[in-house]
């Protein structure tokens, strides 16, 4: 429940459009012990590509690109009866406003690929 | 390349710690045509859970929870020789500062589960 029940939600229409943001990141329990080798061990493996933009915060975002069209079977062969597809997520980033060296930013939505999963093909019935 | 090559990067030590942010989101129309049924068609299917927090922006975040320990085979049975694992990503959210109804926020890192992938078990070589 909100700390201040009477406060407008930041997504409300009447909420101020410009706010102050402290960039000292608070690190909620981000458990980094998690296995980072899934990209290699997955039946839908992926490569990670560095997306860098100095006008954005964070300036570096890693994006996944599936290695195969199909999925890797138990023998290590690619099975094209299944499909490797990217799992995408909308994230928020801060984009520097275009005035020279300003400390003003605008929120921006970005669609990023986080990893890949193996799916069964879907056959749409054509009339 | 940056619009303002001489400007400090927002991740630099000498960058101001507090900035102004415009909440009018740029890029609202991120391609929502992306298949939303992967969670059901995947060999490592997942359910989506609503994580709501009015003190956070965005206040609603959807998180994935793998349905099975193992992965679903071609016959629809769960194969426990493979593992369904969550693909996690660190995202940035805005957390309202604790002063009453303030328009001040702080950046916060959050580890979210975006979907699941099927991985082969790995045995770390034990000395």
């Amino acid at each position: 429940s909100p700390q201040n029940p009477g406060c407008p939600n930041a997504e409300d229409k009447n909420f101020p459009r410009t706010v102050m943001v402290n960039l000292n990141i608070r690190n909620r329990n981000t458990n980094s012990k998690r296995a980072s080798d899934y990209y290699n061990r997955s039946s839908s493996p992926w490569n990670l590509h560095r997306n860098e933009d100095p006008e954005r915060y964070p300036s570096v975002i890693w994006e996944a690109k599936c290695r195969h069209l199909g999925c890797v079977d138990a023998d290590g062969n690619v099975d094209y009866h299944m499909n490797s597809v990217p799992i995408q997520q909308e994230i928020l980033v801060l984009r520097r406003e275009p005035r020279h060296c300003t400390n003003s930013f605008r929120l921006e939505k970005m669609l990023v690929s986080v990893g890949c999963t193996c799916v069964t093909p879907i056959v749409r019935h054509v009339a | 390349s940056p619009q303002n090559p001489g400007c400090p990067n927002a991740e630099d030590k000498n960058f101001p710690r507090t900035v102004m942010v415009n909440l009018n989101i740029r890029n609202r129309n991120t391609n929502s045509k992306r298949a939303s049924d992967y969670y059901n068609r995947s060999s490592s299917p997942w359910n989506l859970h609503r994580n709501e927090d009015p003190e956070r922006y965005p206040s609603v975040i959807w998180e994935a929870k793998c349905r099975h320990l193992g992965c679903v085979d071609a016959d629809g049975n769960v194969d426990y020789h493979m593992n369904s694992v969550p693909i996690q990503q660190e995202i940035l959210v805005l957390r309202r500062e604790p002063r009453h109804c303030t328009n001040s926020f702080r950046l916060e890192k959050m580890l979210v589960s975006v979907g699941c992938t099927c991985v082969t078990p790995i045995v770390r070589h034990v000395a």
Epitope: N29 | H49, K65, C66, R67, S84, V85, C116, R124
Partner: nanobody, 128 residues
Framework: EVQLVESGGGLVQAGGSLRLSCAAS????????IGWFRQAPGKEREGVSC????????FYADSVKGRFTVSADNAKNTVYLQMNSLEPEDTAVYFC?????????????????????WGQGTQVTVSS
């Protein structure tokens, strides 16, 4: 080679107790966390409890909380599952497994996941 062998299963009356053992070889509990799982006939395998020797942390499924307790004997490289107040619904084959990840906040099917090796299982039958 990483191996796990369960024992201690059997037939018990409702309200009774059993202690299952999971003897590990080819690794120590510093290398992997240990999970207990079970599979009832015609049902899916589900998590029961997790154990990590690094800090002695444990985790239990809601269905067994307060009735089951996990412990370890590092010298014997064995993990135990003490099951009290058993109910007919606890009837299943019980497996222990070496797992890569134990994370209570994780969005896996259970708090310990990414199984490295399963044991062969031991049958527990609770009669009413």
């Amino acid at each position: 080679e990483v191996q796990l062998v369960e024992s201690g299963g059997g037939l018990v009356q409702a309200g009774g107790s059993l202690r299952l053992s999971c003897a590990a070889s080819g690794f120590t509990f510093d290398d992997y966390d240990i999970g207990w799982f079970r599979q009832a006939p015609g049902k899916e395998r589900e998590g029961v409890s997790c154990f990590t020797s690094s800090d002695g942390r444990t985790f239990y499924a809601d269905s067994v909380k307060g009735r089951f307790t996990v412990s370890a004997d590092n010298a014997k490289n064995t993990v135990y599952l003490q099951m009290n107040s058993l109910e007919p619904e606890d009837t299943a084959v019980y497996f222990c497994a070496a797992v890569n990840t134990f994370d209570e906040s994780a969005y896996a099917a259970f708090a310990c996941y990414d199984v490295v090796r399963w044991g062969q299982g031991t049958q527990v039958t609770v009669s009413s």
